[in-house]
């Protein structure tokens, strides 16, 4: 038993041209989260096949709002590790899928909406208990940087978490027949509890006397490779008991990889590189089918017509992608004219129009200058979807038809008297006040009380009135 740990370091635009559009905006803030899916063996990416080793979801990251005009930066990430516990042995070879999801937090009808931003996949060999392995994967214009490791849960140790170690009873040596638990030399290998003869490299046990096999091995002692084809007759004396040993001295002799996979020898076993559409330790598993439920967001799955396309997802309105995983951002095409606000309701698109405009796409201007005259030399100005007249001096009103009284608003302070003038207005101030609007009291010594200096500026500072 143990835990696979994944640390996401960064998710952002990859190098080179074609930087991706920020996934979030001021209008539609969002946050990221990640999903990891693990499968044993060296299976090729099969997006929605079962995550036989386990899967995990991260927490949600901080809310992010795009800065207008700025390029998409590395996006804020969730805290902490993604942890995938495994109950049995760590297989040593595994496949991973890491998905970056966006949770939109805007004015959504029916709660937040999720969409898949990027998916990366790979095949790796990894010893449990080893150091953190760093990786960089690219998906389109996005780049994901991460580290991963597998660690055993005590008392399990070793690169497959199949050996049990206990602290030494004596400081100098282990008990009779027991070796140090390399690389943990301060501990000793626990007494053998598996069934006698259980293969130490292909078998393991969790209870005394049992012998459970790692993927690719079978038999009571896990010494027999799983065959991908039925053997018609035994080959050689050692295969008489099973009839299905890989023929020849090398593990790739007779090519154990099915479906056109190519075989490579490893230090103690073999690995298959599988063609498209196949995965598994021996490329024995064909592509995803509808039984695996590969269609997201209510997509309808139907069986594909050819082997390379095992299924097809028919997506509901508002979603696209081979797995209906992408939310169609129909608002990105800016269908609402004249500054209208776009709302994607899933089943339909709606434009919320600014004042003065109407129509499904806010294309109709309700109030413009066409055919409208402004009297007394005024000029018509369009703005914000409603027309207005900029009137000549001395006139006002919607169409500049009213004679303006500049004194109507009582602009002269402290009892000053207002006089209309061809150039505007003049204030005659009451005794003790001065200024264009009689706003400043005159001190008895003749100095005027000017406005106080703003906070942080000394009196006498030249900018104090800026």
């Amino acid at each position: 038993a143990g835990v696979f740990e994944l640390q996401i370091h960064s998710f952002g635009p990859g190098p080179g041209p074609g930087a991706p559009r920020s996934p979030c905006s001021a209008r539609l803030p969002c946050r990221l989260f990640f999903r990891v899916c693990l499968k044993p063996g060296l299976s090729e990416e099969a997006a929605e096949s079962p995550c036989a080793l386990g899967a995990a979801l991260s927490a949600r990251g901080p809310v992010y709002t795009e800065q207008p005009g700025a390029p998409a930066p590395d996006l804020p990430l969730p805290d902490g590790l993604l942890q995938v516990p495994f109950r049995d042995a760590w297989p040593g070879t595994f496949s991973f899928i890491i998905e970056t999801w966006r949770e939109e937090l805007g004015d959504q009808i029916g709660g937040p909406a999720w969409s898949l931003l990027a998916r990366v996949a790979g095949r790796r060999r990894l010893a449990a208990g080893g150091p953190w392995a760093r990786d960089i994967q690219r998906a389109g214009a996005w780049e994901l940087r991460f580290s991963y490791r597998a660690r055993c849960e005590p008392p399990a140790v070793g690169t497959a978490c199949t050996r049990l170690c206990r602290p030494r009873s004596a400081p100098s040596r282990c008990g009779p027949g027991l070796r140090p638990c390399a690389p943990l030399e301060d501990e000793c290998e626990a007494p053998l509890v598996c069934r006698a003869g259980c293969s130490p490299e292909h078998g393991f046990c969790e209870q005394p006397g049992e012998c459970r096999c790692l993927e690719g091995w079978t038999g009571p002692l896990c010494t027999v490779p799983v065959s991908t084809s039925s053997c018609l007759s035994p080959r050689g004396p050692s295969s008489a008991t099973t009839g299905c040993l890989v023929p020849g001295p090398g593990p790739c002799d007779g090519n154990p990889c099915a479906n056109g996979g190519s075989c490579s020898e490893t230090p103690r076993s073999f690995e298959c590189t599988c063609p498209r559409g196949f995965y598994g330790l021996r490329c024995e598993v064909s592509g995803v089918t509808c039984a695996d439920g590969p269609c997201f967001n209510g997509g309808l799955c139907v069986g594909g017509a050819d082997p390379d396309s095992a299924y097809i997802c028919h997506c509901p309105p508002g979603f696209q992608g081979s797995n209906c995983e992408k939310r169609v951002d129909r608002c990105s095409l800016q269908p609402c004219r004249n500054g209208g606000l776009c709302l994607d309701l899933g089943h339909a698109l709606r434009c919320r129009c600014r004042a003065g405009f109407a129509g499904p796409r806010c294309e109709h201007d309700l109030d413009d200058c066409a055919g409208r005259a402004c009297a007394n030399g005024g000029t018509c100005v369009e703005g914000g979807g409603a027309h207005r007249c900029s009137c000549a001096l001395g006139f006002g009103g919607r169409d500049c038809r009213e004679r303006a009284d500049p004194c109507a608003a009582r602009p002269c302070a402290h009892g000053g008297r207002c006089y209309a003038h061809f150039s505007g207005l003049v204030c005659a101030c009451a005794p003790g006040y001065m200024g264009a609007r009689c706003e400043f009291p005159v001190h008895p010594d003749g100095a005027s009380a000017l406005p106080a200096a703003p906070p942080g500026l000394r009196p006498g500072d030249p900018q104090r009135y800026l």
Epitope: A89, G92, R125, A127, G158, T266, P267, R268
Partner: antibody
Framework: QVTLKESGPGILQPSQTLSLTCSFS??????????VGWIRQPSGKGLEWLAL???????RYNPALKSRLTISKDASSSQVFLKIASVDTADTATYYC????????????????WGQGTSVSVSS | QIVLTQSPALMSASPGEKVTMTCSVT?????MYWYQQKPRSSPKPWIY???NLASGVPARFSGSGSGTSYSLTISSVEAEDAATYYC?????????FGSGTKVEIK
């Protein structure tokens, strides 16, 4: 203390079979996770991996030389043997044996102890 | 087969300098192993499982990398570090070595 020591004929003629022996102490080739490998190095050149044998008799050979190589062991006498058939001058090199540790599954921890090497010259 | 390319082939450094050598791999591997060899001596294990120092290796050495790019770094090189360093992969047979990086001390 782990030690390994190689021995061989020193000089032999083309087309003969080269027989090498690796005698070791400090570990047992009956112990799970233990292996012994052979590596060679022509004078002034780099290292070339040849073959290895594990405690459970799993063997690996360099595919380029596989048809000429045979590796075997005698765990009770702590020896590993390598035979190279039909040698020629290109097989002139220093031959090393080394212990390999792979405690679990299919991942090598380290090739952690090496012998001092034995020099082999093929000439007519 | 997996080919390991070491660079540079030869490097010269003064004592106290930081030295980094790289090992590029034609196909992704999970771990890299490094060996040190001095003239007329057998190779010594130096770094295993990418970043673990073998017994007796000074802490000024470090290993890092993943996938197809690995490196060995000496933070402050000393005269005794003059040697040839080989990288090796244990992913696929043949378990190949790099051609070596020779470190000379000025």
């Amino acid at each position: 203390q782990v030690t390994l020591k190689e021995s061989g004929p020193g000089i032999l003629q083309p087309s003969q079979t080269l027989s090498l022996t690796c005698s070791f102490s400090g570990f047992s080739l009956s112990t799970s996770g233990m292996g012994v490998g052979w590596i060679r190095q022509p004078s002034g050149k780099g290292l070339e991996w040849l073959a290895l044998i594990w405690w459970d008799d799993v063997k690996r050979y360099n595919p380029a030389l596989k048809s000429r190589l045979t590796i075997s062991k005698d765990a009770s006498s702590s020896q590993v043997f390598l035979k190279i058939a039909s040698v020629d001058t290109a097989d002139t090199a220093t031959y090393y044996c080394a212990r390999i540790a792979s405690y679990d599954y299919d991942v090598v921890y380290a090739m952690d102890y090496w012998g001092q090497g034995t020099s082999v010259s093929v000439s007519s | 087969q997996i080919v390991l390319t070491q660079s540079p082939a030869l490097m010269s450094a003064s004592p106290g300098e930081k030295v980094t050598m790289t090992c590029s791999v034609t196909s992704s591997v999970s771990y890299m192993y490094w060996y040190q060899q001095k003239p007329r001596s057998s190779p010594k294990p130096w770094i295993y499982l990418t970043s673990n120092l073998a017994s007796g290796v000074p802490a000024r050495f470090s290993g890092s990398g993943s996938g197809t790019s690995y490196s060995l770094t000496i933070s402050s090189v000393e005269a005794e570090d003059a040697a040839t360093y080989y990288c090796q992969q244990w992913r696929n047979n043949p378990f190949t070595f790099g051609s070596g990086t020779k470190v000379e001390i000025k």
